[in-house]
């Protein structure tokens, strides 16, 4: 993700306009306060994506953090996000407005917490006070977040001075909550199972010797009870586990499994839940598709990635032109499939220093006994243009014929240009483009051939010059998305005894 301007922090003048652009190889969007403000998304000509957030007539209320995130279906674990923070110093505002629920800060243990009084101007000095006592507290202040520290159960207020005016924030109320010291964790061997497979869920408590386990699970509704097994794992700290095991899962076993743990001696308790899905058959489904044509550049490495979801674990094969691919011993080709979550997979084909011969049709196939998917695309290898020859001939009719031949992928464009002043050519004088001129001084003919075995285009361009009355420097330039190449020749009139 690339944000322009890059940040990470901006201070804007009130009433100004500010434009933020986020660009990436995948669709992106701006988020503010976990929401999507109005923005203009676009796909650029080079295949990248961008989203433009225009903040017009900014006020202090626009102070805050802004995120650029991938607008994709991969979920947070594969999502990247970039943050910037904007200040709009607003002397009329002082502290940013807060909602009443944010003024009550509940602390569950002796950990750092934040009193989120924020100002619009990063230059302002902000102090924290107990409301009853007007002495500033020595707590670090972060202009983007507020005061960060450990706070007692008291009432607090933030203060700053704008000009010669002292400004107070809303009042913040800190409450410590006594919570259970029980540490419960629930995990399942698998949260997705096929009918007929087993469900095993463990509920583990650390550091407590006398605990009571109570399970709730979908089978209870139909009165079919499952007897959990309690497992004592002595050590430091001691662990007690309760294991719920259903050897043959049915579709109706899908749902929430909750483990409630209570300690009878002090009435402390805690519960954790986990969702299990029972499916009729296994599945494989693509989460993303690829463009039909993928581009690689000659001698550069290229990774092609397919993201899919499956259960049970599928086999993955890659094919090129219907032949199975495998990791090459020379390290020119690397295949990898990794499990990024319980049912999500990323399969990658990496072509190291791509060769022309690697162009072709590729297919990834993911399959198991129940289901299969495949994804196919054409790999185009782009090759820089080369001018292979620029030759000259003199037919008897007094014409000069120039023939320019070159190759490249994608198809090169040909441009002919000429320069008459040889001393100043071409550095000090712009060449004049040539083409099919109406005065019939020159005639241009271009033929294009696609060479299947080389997977590249050959361009042959012939330029006929009707009459040349003085020496000319003629340039043939080929150009494609990979670059350009050119050759020059000096053409002299038939009458001049002049050789290059």
């Amino acid at each position: 993700l690339v944000i322009t301007p890059p940040g990470p922090e901006f201070v804007l003048n009130i009433s100004s306009t500010f434009v933020l652009t986020c660009s990436s190889s995948a669709p992106v969007m701006w988020e503010q306060m976990s929401q999507v403000p109005w923005q203009e998304a676009a796909m650029n000509q080079d295949g990248t994506f961008s989203s433009v957030l225009t903040l017009t007539n900014v006020t202090g209320g626009d102070t805050g953090e802004y995120f650029c995130v991938y607008n994709n279906s991969l979920g947070p674990e594969l999502s990247e996000r970039k943050r910037i923070y904007i200040f709009v110093p607003d002397p009329t505002m002082g502290f940013l407005p807060m909602d009443s629920e944010d003024l009550f800060i509940f602390v569950t243990d002796v950990t750092e917490t934040t009193i989120p009084c924020r100002v619009t101007d990063p230059q302002l000095e902000v102090t924290l006070h107990e409301k009853k006592v007007d002495i500033p507290l020595h707590v670090p202040y972060d202009h983007q977040r507020g005061f960060i520290g450990t706070f007692e159960d008291k009432t607090y207020i933030c203060k700053t001075t704008i000009g010669d005016r002292e400004v107070d924030s809303d009042t913040y109320y800190v409450y410590s909550l006594q919570v259970s010291s029980i540490n419960v964790s629930v995990n399942a061997v698998q949260t997705v199972v096929r009918q007929g497979e087993s469900i095993t869920i463990r509920c583990i408590v650390m550091g407590n010797d006398v605990v009571n386990f109570q399970w709730t699970y979908p089978r209870m509704k139909s009165g079919r009870l499952v007897e959990p097994v309690t497992d004592y794992l002595f050590g430091v700290p001691s662990r007690i586990g309760s294991i719920l095991h259903i050897p043959t899962a049915e579709l109706s076993d899908s749902g929430t499994y909750t483990c409630n743990v209570s300690v009878s001696v002090n009435d402390h308790g805690d519960e954790k839940a986990i969702n299990v899905t029972v499916i009729e058959n296994g599945y494989v489904r693509l989460l993303e598709t690829l463009e039909d044509v993928q581009i690689a550049e000659l001698h550069r490495s290229r990774t092609l990635q397919v993201v899919f979801e499956a259960y049970p674990t599928p086999s993955v094969l890659w094919f090129k032109d219907n032949r199975t691919l495998g990791d090459s011993s020379a390290g020119e080709l690397v295949l990898s499939t990794r499990n990024v979550s319980e049912t999500r997979y990323v399969s990658e084909l990496t072509l190291v220093r791509v060769k022309v011969s690697e162009a072709g049709y590729y297919t990834m196939r993911a399959f198991h006994a129940d289901d299969q998917v495949q994804l196919s695309f054409k790999l185009q290898v782009n090759v820089p243009v080369r001018v292979l020859e620029l030759s000259e001939s003199h037919p008897a009719n007094g014409e000069q014929i120039l023939r320019c031949r070159g190759r490249g992928m994608p198809q090169p464009n040909v441009t002919w240009s000429t320069c008459r002043d040889l001393k100043r050519c071409p550095r000090k004088l712009s060449p004049t483009p040539l083409g099919n001129s109406s005065k019939e001084e020159s005639q241009l003919e271009t033929n294009v051939t696609f060479w299947e075995e080389d997977q590249e285009y050959e361009v042959v361009s012939t330029l006929r010059l009707r009459h040349v009355d003085q020496p000319l420097s003629v340039r043939c330039m080929l150009q494609n998305s990979m670059g350009r190449d050119s050759q020059e020749v000096t053409v002299v009139p038939h009458s001049l005894p002049f050789k290059v």
Partner: nanobody, 124 residues
Framework: EVQLVESGGGLVQIGDSLRLSCAAS????????MGWFRQAPGKEREFVAA????????NYADFVKGRFTISRYNAKNTAYLQMNSLKPEDTAVYYC?????????????????WGQGTQVTVSS
Amino acid sequence: EVQLVESGGGLVQIGDSLRLSCAASGGTFNRYGMGWFRQAPGKEREFVAAIRWDGVDTNYADFVKGRFTISRYNAKNTAYLQMNSLKPEDTAVYYCAADRRGLYTKHAHRYDYWGQGTQVTVSS
């Protein structure tokens, strides 16, 4: 400057439905996030529902979920609040608000423009 005008309020019985409209003029409506708030006599103004600039996402207060639906018709510069299964506690003046950044939050202080309000009374 954006002007917002609410309409569609009135007196209804418990369990009835009403549809409030909010007509906007003087701005680029399809860039604004739109929200509905309400204020009952003697109470603070409270958030009811909001909708993103493009209608893709919505935000509801817990007490109206499943009963009220917010929508918008950008071509007509209008936002709507469909209220079903009305209760006496829904009696209030309902205000329409617009956020020029396209946000759709429950935070009243984020909204830049407000309508005059329309009275909804649910009688028992």
